[in-house]
């Protein structure tokens, strides 16, 4: 539960996160498990600890081993382990299984390949992508944020895809590569103009001040795996991330494929500790794909605490 496998290539950056739950204010100490020797926090060191993160800049084969992180809260010390393996770079093109991240699959309509572990790094776009060691070129391939999009996927697109990016630490640059397999599903599907199943247009959602509230934006986009379909929430016409209210966050729900084959997406808007001012906002559920955009608007109203009849509409 609290031991995590991590791997990387020599002379590349590797960043590992302690697998224990903690708060940013907690102190985290890192040790070499075998020697119990403390890992320094000074950034001038090639291997150093930075809170929840252990950084190898760059990694060496000799760094392989088990590292202990101790998360120190005011009440407890909790221990986690990072099992790190650093491999020599292969001279040939073949990427061995032990360097592969989880396989992803796509289809003609949906072909996103995410670059594994990239969220741990300080990187800037664009990513470089390779298939079977060849740089991907041509208009069918688009590097977008932390993923690769392949247009008009064919079965020949299956293979091993490597993303390459630069991690920047205090002005120094380090290369990182990560590889995963991509398989292609043969799927006869279609896409439609988005259909929002929830919320209803102009729905009034009853909430209790001081409680948590969830709003779910749910939309279907057609049959089979969809290409470039998204659901999201806006507050007063502004993206959640730009609105700047930490109590209000959106969280991706499950990708759903119903028995009738419809492909649907959910986005849950979580409002912590509902406040009076939240009732003044306009909440827009947006569903968009290649056909266009559909919007349903929700407003919040104060629920009478002694009105039990509608309590089943309210989730934490």
């Amino acid at each position: 539960k609290f031991s995590k496998q991590s791997w990387g290539l020599e002379n590349e950056a590797l960043i590992v996160r302690c697998p224990r739950q903690g708060k940013p204010s907690y102190t985290v100490d890192w040790y070499y498990s075998q020697t119990n020797k403390s890992i320094p926090t000074q950034e001038r060191n090639r291997v150093f600890a930075s809170g929840q993160l252990l950084k190898f800049l760059p990694a060496a084969v000799a760094d392989s081993g088990i590292y202990t992180c101790i998360v120190r809260s005011p009440t407890f010390n909790r221990t986690g382990y990072a099992n790190v393996t650093i491999y020599k770079k292969q001279s040939d093109c073949n990427v061995p299984d032990y360097l592969m991240y989880s396989t992803v699959s796509g289809s003609e309509k949906n072909s996103k390949i995410y670059c594994p572990t990239i969220d741990l790094y300080n990187w800037t776009a664009p990513l470089e992508w390779f298939k079977n060691c060849q740089a991907l070129q041509g208009s069918r391939y688009r590097a977008h944020k932390s993923f690769l999009v392949i247009d008009n996927v064919m079965t020949e697109d299956a293979g091993d895809y490597t993303c390459k990016f630069i991690h920047n630490e205090n002005g120094a640059n380090y290369s990182v590569t990560a590889t995963r397999s991509f398989t292609v599903k043969d799927e006869q599907g279609f896409s439609l103009f988005p259909v929002i199943g929830a919320p209803a247009q102009n729905e009034i959602k009853e909430v209790e001040i001081g409680k948590n509230a969830n709003l779910t934006c749910s939309a279907c986009f057609g049959k089979g795996t969809q290409f470039l379909a998204a659901v999201l929430w806006q507050l007063n016409g502004t993206k959640i991330t730009d609105f700047g209210e930490p109590r209000i966050q959106q969280e991706e729900g499950q990708n759903q494929s119903f028995s009738n084959g419809l492909a649907c997406l959910d986005m849950v808007l979580r409002i912590a500790d509902v406040k009076e001012e939240d009732l003044l906002l306009q909440y827009d559920c947006l569903a968009l794909n290649l056909h266009g955009l559909r919007r349903h608007t929700v407003r919040l109203s104060r629920k009478n605490p002694i009105d039990h009849h509608s309590h089943h509409h309210h989730h934490h």
Partner: antibody, heavy 117, light 106 residues
Framework: EVQLQQSVAELVRPGASVKLSCTAS????????MHWVKQRPEQGLEWIGR????????EYAPKFQDKATMTADTSSNTAYLQLSSLTSEDTAVYYC??????????WGQGTSVTVSS | ETTVTQSPASLSVATGEKVTIRCITN??????IHWYQQKPGEPPKLLIS???TLRPGVPSRFSSSGYGTDFVFTIENTLSEDVADYYC????????FGAGTKLELK
């Protein structure tokens, strides 16, 4: 020495709500998590949930999702538990307890809540 | 949801005897289990934290062992002051207490 001060007892009518308080001394509640635990007469302990007072994030045991609301006021170093739509099933001692994400280290003396008409 | 089955519900021992309490979880939780003692009219007190770690000030006659799904709490040479209810707590997934064990003296 860390101490958690809770009011001793509350007598409330069925259907009403009650808000319990827990004030910490010699400890800044925003530095850790506050848990709430229920204990019915002659029964075992039930975990209600935990709050991260620094940011207000809460997590509830499924059973208490619609019953309990945890809040915290870091300026007064106080955590609160509000219980709504009270019934005789809610008659219990309610403990606040400081700890990390995984367990509780320091406990209050408990507030006895009696629901009776 | 992780559930915890604690046994026995109660037991009666003579002073100096050994006490063994067991908790079984329905999923593998490594060693993320804690043991609490609750004396009458008092709040619970943490005796042993995860990884079988004795809390500061807790006598060494208390110990625990186990990993995965099966956990045991032991009191060697029980004293009269050990009369209390004992609870295990799993914190792998949410938090769940065992039903408790009432320890009495013969």
């Amino acid at each position: 020495e860390v101490q958690l001060q809770q009011s001793v007892a509350e007598l409330v009518r069925p259907g009403a709500s009650v808000k319990l308080s827990c004030t910490a001394s010699a400890f800044n509640i925003k530095d850790d998590y506050m848990h709430w635990v229920k204990q019915r007469p002659e029964q075992g302990l039930e975990w209600i949930g935990r709050i991260d007072p620094a940011i207000g994030n809460t997590e509830y045991a499924p059973k208490f999702q619609d019953k309990a609301t945890m809040t915290a006021d870091t300026s007064s170093n106080t955590a609160y538990l509000q219980l709504s739509s009270l019934t005789s099933e809610d008659t219990a001692v309610y403990y606040c307890a400081l700890g990390d994400f995984y367990a509780m280290a320091y406990w209050g003396q408990g507030t006895s809540v009696t629901v009776s008409s | 949801e992780t559930t915890v089955t604690q046994s026995p519900a109660s037991l009666s021992v003579a002073t100096g005897e050994k006490v063994t309490i067991r908790c079984i979880t329905n999923t593998d939780i490594d060693d993320v289990i804690h043991w609490y003692q609750q004396k009458p009219g008092e709040p619970p007190k943490l005796l042993i934290s995860e990884g079988n770690t004795l809390r500061p000030g807790v006598p060494s006659r208390f110990s625990s062992s186990g990993y995965g799904t099966d956990f045991v709490f032991t009191i060697e040479n029980t004293l009269s002051e050990d009369v209390a209810d004992y609870y295990c707590l799993q914190s792998d997934n949410m938090l769940t207490f065992g039903a408790g064990t009432k320890l009495e003296l013969k």
